[in-house]
């Protein structure tokens, strides 16, 4: 029961996390910046991975995609890649984990197979969460670096003066959504991995076997039983040799020098 709960909770937490990663990737508010201020109006912009929007205190808003821009920061492409990889891995993980859920019966799927699938989805969720956290952190670092590198300077350009304006950068809501979502996906993945251990316990319950030679000249055959790990083919503790062997369940016998337990 605890295993089912852990697995189910891990799935739900990961589902919320991946939904958050998708939301963060699509959001425009990765960073916000004041662009211009005067006593009448204020202009600020918020930037996402795919487009930048300008909003004025008057209510005017205009968004523009980066496809019009040459020379996008390489870091932005890296962040995009990390977030997309996170989403893809998370989506595959969700698909796998649905079939791995203990509460869902699909044909005659054994617990060992479900355990393997649970572990696979758990690992996928962990990597997905790490990708999201890495992506958001790289972006945050890029903002901080760009802020400190572009100190106010003035130089003469073609057709007049060019001045870099020092404005205030703040982390956008998407960064926090991304960090939390990545963390949730990571936690969900860990829970799935824990649930996997419960689904496939190390079964070391050896059955005691008594070998009775049919004649005095017949020696016992060693290695009559194999320990089951839950992943092997001999999960039912079937008899391997039947040459005069009987389990304790079948025949009650007295100890002898030929007994093998």
């Amino acid at each position: 029961m605890a295993v089912t709960a852990c697995q189910g909770l891990g799935f739900v937490v990961s589902l919320i996390g991946i939904a958050g990663i998708i939301a963060a990737t699509c959001m425009d508010q990765w960073s916000t910046q004041d662009l211009y201020n005067n006593p009448v109006t204020a202009v600020f912009n918020y930037q996402g991975l795919w487009r930048s929007c300008v909003r004025e205190s008057s209510g005017f808003t205009e968004c523009r995609g980066y496809f019009t821009l040459l020379g996008l920061p390489a870091m932005l492409q890296a962040v995009r890649a990390l977030m997309i990889v996170g989403i893809v891995l998370g989506a595959i993980g969700l698909l796998v984990s649905i079939f791995a859920l203990k509460c869902i019966r699909i044909g005659s799927m054994e617990d060992s197979a479900k355990a393997n699938m649970t572990l696979t989805s758990g690992i996928m969720f962990i990597v997905s969460g790490l990708c999201a956290i890495a992506g958001v952190s790289v972006f945050a670092n890029m903002l901080v670096t760009n802020f400190w590198m572009s100190t106010a300077n003035m130089y003469t350009g073609m057709g007049g003066m060019v001045q870099t304006v020092q404005t205030r950068y703040t982390f956008g809501a998407a960064l926090f959504v991304g960090w939390v979502a990545g963390g949730l996906t990571l936690i969900g993945g860990v829970m799935m991995c824990i649930a996997c251990r419960g689904l496939a316990p190390e079964e070391t319950n050896y059955k005691a076997v008594s070998y009775h030679a049919s004649g005095h000249s017949v020696a016992y055959k060693p290695g009559g039983f194999k320990a089951s790990t839950g992943f092997g083919s001999n999960t039912k503790n079937k008899k391997i040799y039947d040459g005069g062997a009987r389990t304790e369940d079948e025949v009650q016998s007295y100890p002898s020098k030929h007994d093998y337990v």
Partner: nanobody, 120 residues
Framework: EVQLVESGGGLVQPGGSLRLSCAAS????????YGWYRQAPGKGRELVAT???????YYADSMKGRSTISRDNAKNTVYLQMNSLKPEDTAVYYC??????????????WGQGTLVTVSS
């Protein structure tokens, strides 16, 4: 790099009108604010008027009621219509644009200036 080309300056009689224009060209992401500044002989540069991309305007007291700033976002051009000009309006008028640079600080670009002389 942004190039600003100003035009419309010249000699005008007191009480007359003048329309300045400034066109921005080159490779840039987006202009978020256009402005006009002026610098009279022997004085510092002062603001005349600004207009945002959305059309919000701001005028300095010195030219309030006598000037109108407008812009054409599609053409990246800003205009300054000045009426009832006085001799004290004589100055070099500079065009200014603030350009958004994604993930970086914005840049202010300044034109070379166009001379407006108000004299009889």
């Amino acid at each position: 790099e942004v190039q600003l080309v100003e035009s419309g300056g010249g000699l005008v009689q007191p009480g007359g009108s003048l329309r300045l224009s400034c066109a921005a060209s080159g490779s840039f992401f987006r202009i978020v604010m256009y402005g006009w500044y002026r610098q009279a002989p022997g004085k510092g540069r002062e603001l005349v008027a600004t207009i945002t991309r959305g059309g919000s305007t701001y005028y300095a007291d010195s030219m309030k009621g006598r000037s109108t700033i407008s812009r054409d976002n599609a053409k990246n051009t800003v205009y300054l219509q000045m009426n009832s000009l006085k001799p004290e309006d004589t100055a070099v008028y500079y065009c200014n644009v603030r350009v958004e640079v994604p993930f970086m600080q914005p840049n202010d670009y300044w034109g070379q200036g166009t001379l407006v002389t108000v004299s009889s």
